[in-house]
Amino acid sequence: GIAIPRNSGCPNSEDKNFPRTVMVNLNIHNRNTSTNPKRSSDYYNRSTSPWNLHRNEDPERYPSVIWEAKCRHLGCVKADGNVDYHMNSVPIQQEILVLRREPRHCPNSFRLEKILVSVGCTCVTPIVHHVA
Amino acid sequence: GIAIPRNSGCPNSEDKNFPRTVMVNLNIHNRNTSTNPKRSSDYYNRSTSPWNLHRNEDPERYPSVIWEAKCRHLGCVKADGNVDYHMNSVPIQQEILVLRREPRHCPNSFRLEKILVSVGCTCVTPIVHHVA
């Protein structure tokens, strides 16, 4: 990792596992966009690979609500509204950081967790496997 | 918020702003996927709305490296490889949580921050077909 110069104004850590356990201020710095993707974009309906958004809720996780995209079709929508099965709608996935309460139910102790979420869908050309 | 039953085995918090400041274990729980999106999928190249991935690095942030998608074209790519301007390539954006060192350079004190990242691109059309 990158060596960070110690600032004399930093909080002290008595934790034996330092720097694996750190203090985190949950007062989120910038809230300039909506957490509900339906409010922040309507691409899910206008895309040639449209998707539906499913609410995933877990009170032991922060954020407790995450929206998961599920592609509506196997193929992609053409200009005439029909589905073209020569193309594929596929989910674009991203790893995100969440905080998991650990031990469970503890209000002020968390563990960092990486989870894979589907953010939306895109239309791709299928991989053609040429059989010898 | 949801009321969490207090577990007697929970760490104690003396912070006056509790529960805004919490303890977080940075030992990430599941690393089952690759953090470099170029390794985890080739959709960025096969999509009708292809994108390039740009590395955004910030040592004051955790994770310090984030990949940003930039759509390659204004239009979408047709089967013959030409760009179709009857449609647009647009970035799918998602809010993610990151940890920002606060005060700056402190190794064990962070603030939660929401940032908007472009994860990939999708192809949108002006004609919306409401599929049942």
Epitope: S41, R46 | H86, N88, Q93, P126
Partner: antibody, heavy 118, light 110 residues
Framework: EVQLLESGGGLVQPGGSLRLSCAAS????????MSWVRQAPGKGLEWVSA????????YYADSVKGRFTISRDNSKNTLYLQMNSLRAEDTAVYYC???????????WGQGTLVTVSS | NFMLTQPHSVSESPGKTVTISCTRS????????VQWYQQRPGSSPTIVIF?????PSGVPDRFSGSIDSSSNSASLTISGLKTEDEADYYC?????????FGGGTKLTVL
């Protein structure tokens, strides 16, 4: 219902500056490209500038390139047009429009009049 | 930049059909959508046809759009003319770098 409300127009001297705003409502602002179109008194429509939904791409007519700057604040659902080095020929009603895709303006505001005169 | 050429004015009687043409000077019209806007005196433009032939909700089916690739032109046809159709009509198209409007056609309903 899509609503676009322009403001910021007025009388300005040649060489002066003005900033137009367009407050949008009734749709998910950040997922639509937006444009500015103007109409000189008694004349036809002239496209001025456009910006992508994320704000990452901007486009300008040759007549305003280097003088006008389009921008947007998606957290405020607002589109802007910063107009510098104004000329008499910039006198027009300025409309903001919501683009269904690039080049396809679907909804228009009521316009704001900019008069450049000494 | 390309140009879009429209007739300066057209006139027709109520109940009849009128067609307004729009010719693109360069670049294939079929590669980019054509839109048509109606502007009544003292009002903002409103879209009556987008994406060559799509009618927004609220626009009567008396309005229709088409394109002819062979002549590189688009047409707006209004059937069953009504007095409220009297307005200026603008065609509009684009390329990857700019958006262009036609000069406008004044429709007079006699």
């Amino acid at each position: 219902e899509v609503q676009l409300l322009e403001s910021g127009g007025g009388l300005v001297q040649p060489g002066g500056s003005l900033r137009l705003s367009c407050a949008a409502s009734g749709f998910t602002f950040s997922s639509y490209a937006m444009s500015w179109v103007r109409q000189a008194p008694g004349k036809g429509l002239e496209w001025v500038s456009a910006i992508s939904g994320s704000g990452g791409s901007t486009y300008y007519a040759d007549s305003v390139k280097g003088r006008f700057t389009i921008s947007r604040d998606n957290s405020k659902n607002t589109l802007y047009l910063q107009m510098n080095s104004l000329r008499a020929e910039d006198t027009a009603v300025y409309y903001c429009a919501r683009d269904l895709i690039w080049g396809v303006a679907g909804s228009w505001g009521q316009g704001t009049l900019v008069t450049v005169s000494s | 930049n390309f140009m879009l050429t429209q007739p300066h004015s057209v006139s027709e009687s109520p109940g009849k059909t009128v067609t307004i043409s729009c010719t693109r000077s360069s670049g294939s019209l079929a590669n980019y959508y054509v839109q048509w806007y109606q502007q009544r005196p003292g009002s903002s433009p409103t879209i009556v046809i987008f994406a060559n032939n799509q009618r927004p909700s609220g626009v009567p089916d008396r309005f229709s759009g088409s394109i002819d690739s062979s002549s590189n032109s688009a047409s707006l046809t209004i059937s069953g003319l009504k007095t409220e159709d009297e307005a200026d009509y603008y065609c509009q198209s684009y390329d990857p770098h700019s958006v262009v409007f036609g000069g406008g056609t004044k429709l007079t309903v006699l």
